[in-house]
């Protein structure tokens, strides 16, 4: 056992002062969008391009379809974040070829292999939740025993219903544990 | 756990339709596009076309345009195909699959299989 | 509408011993996003297909690791390193790029 400070909860990755939970069961957009604020984070908004490629690698590397925080909901053909930001034209470049396209109202954003798709928001897909990583103050280090390895979920079937329940409070349940990344 | 199931076994004269019914069980019934694959006797695999349970909204193949419809009841979480004017050569095992975006279009999950026998 | 054309159709195996099945399409099935929308399906007999292989290569969950899938474009390939008993059945590819999704004819691998 040894003292030290984790920024992010267990199972979930830190990247340049914040932390993103990739879930391994699926919901359409709306209930992601639940999920992450039932664990006190947002469904992800991408700020900057080292963001945008660290996230495309880790869903394409898992060939997983990925629920973003980006819709155009409100207003079709304007995409917007979930925090209210609009997506700026220098992110338009992420779009794979010929997306969005909106075929049959699609829309809500995914990761989708090397870029941006946009598709049906009612689908379940993948998604990824992004909060704050923790300021390490000496009051907040904790004692931390070393995390087990995270088994590889099952790739397909393993979506819906009592596996997000379950799910969801597996994020709650490892709040308080801290994981060494 | 993920389950498909389908009616039982039907027999139709030519002429006549046929209606398929897939009680879906363990996943969010709106989330996943429901398929339907036809097989002939000793034959491979046929797709039919998609609904998608959420908005009801369908793509069928060009060969079964006009013959085939595809519908849900969401509240009972189950997709129906009914083919009409059937013919001798629709005698075949129906089978409805799941469609999961996760992962591309793969089908994860499928019925058991329905066995539809048209013969005058 | 894709063509899918499989060989061989009829493959004996020996148990302990590699196969091979080919797939070709029609026209490329490599989406914009990089991914090859290609499935693999085995049927054992008397039964529903059920999954083996996704976008190509990925190996879906609880198929043994004996099983592999490759290839890109209009050339795929499933590989069994080791032929068990078990693997008996009609093996299809199916591509999802657009619809209709179509199927290759099947390949039928018996024990010899």
């Known amino acids: 056992t040894e003292r030290l400070c984790h920024p992010c909860p267990w199972e979930w990755t830190f990247f340049q002062g914040n932390c993103y939970f990739m879930s391994n069961s699926q919901r359409n957009w709306h209930d992601s969008i639940t999920a992450c604020k039932e664990v006190g984070a947002q469904l992800v908004v991408i700020k900057s391009a080292e963001e945008q490629n660290f996230l495309q690698l880790q869903s394409s590397r898992s060939n997983r379809f990925t629920w973003m925080g980006l819709s155009d909901l409100n207003q079709e053909g304007t995409w917007q974040w979930v925090d209210g930001s609009p997506l700026l034209p220098s992110f338009k470049q992420y779009w794979n070829r010929g997306e969005p396209n909106n075929v049959g109202e699609e829309d809500c954003a995914e990761f989708s292999g090397n870029g941006w798709n946009d598709d049906k928001c009612n689908l379940a897909k993948f998604w990824i939740c992004k909060k704050s990583a923790a300021s390490c103050s000496r009051d907040e280090e904790q004692f931390l025993s070393p995390a087990p390895a995270t088994p590889n979920p099952p790739p397909a079937g393993s979506g819906g219903g009592l596996n997000d329940i379950f799910e969801a409070q597996k994020i709650e349940w490892h709040e308080h544990h801290h994981h060494h990344h | 756990q993920v389950q498909l199931v389908q009616s039982g076994a039907e027999v139709k004269k030519p002429g006549a339709s046929v209606k398929v019914s897939c009680k879906a069980s363990g996943y969010t019934f709106t989330g996943y596009y429901i398929n339907w694959v036809r097989q002939a006797p000793g034959q491979g695999l046929e797709w039919m076309g998609w609904i998608n349970p959420n908005s009801g909204d369908t793509n069928y193949a060009q060969k079964f345009q006009g013959r085939v419809t595809m519908t849900r009841d969401p509240s009972i979480s189950t997709a129906y195909m009914e083919l009409s004017r059937l013919r001798s050569d629709d005698t075949a095992v129906y089978y409805c699959a799941r469609e999961n975006s996760g992962y591309g279009k793969l089908f994860d999950y499928w019925g058991q299989g329905t066995l539809v026998t048209v013969s005058s | 509408d894709i063509v899918m054309t499989q060989s061989p159709l009829s493959l004996p195996g020996t148990p302990g011993e590699p196969a091979s099945i080919s797939c070709r399409s029609s026209q490329s099935l490599l989406h914009s996003n990089g991914y090859n929308y290609l499935d693999w399906y085995l049927q054992k007999p008397g039964q529903s297909p059920q999954f083996l292989i996704y976008l190509g290569s990925n190996r879906a969950s609880g198929v043994p690791d004996r099983f592999s899938g490759s290839g890109s474009g209009t050339d795929f390939t499933l590989k069994i390193s080791r032929v068990e008993a078990e693997d008996v059945g009609v093996y299809y590819c199916?591509?999802?790029?657009?619809?209709?999704?179509?199927f290759g004819q099947g390949t039928k691998l018996e024990i010899k």
């Open positions: 199916m591509q999802a790029l657009q619809t209709p999704y179509t």
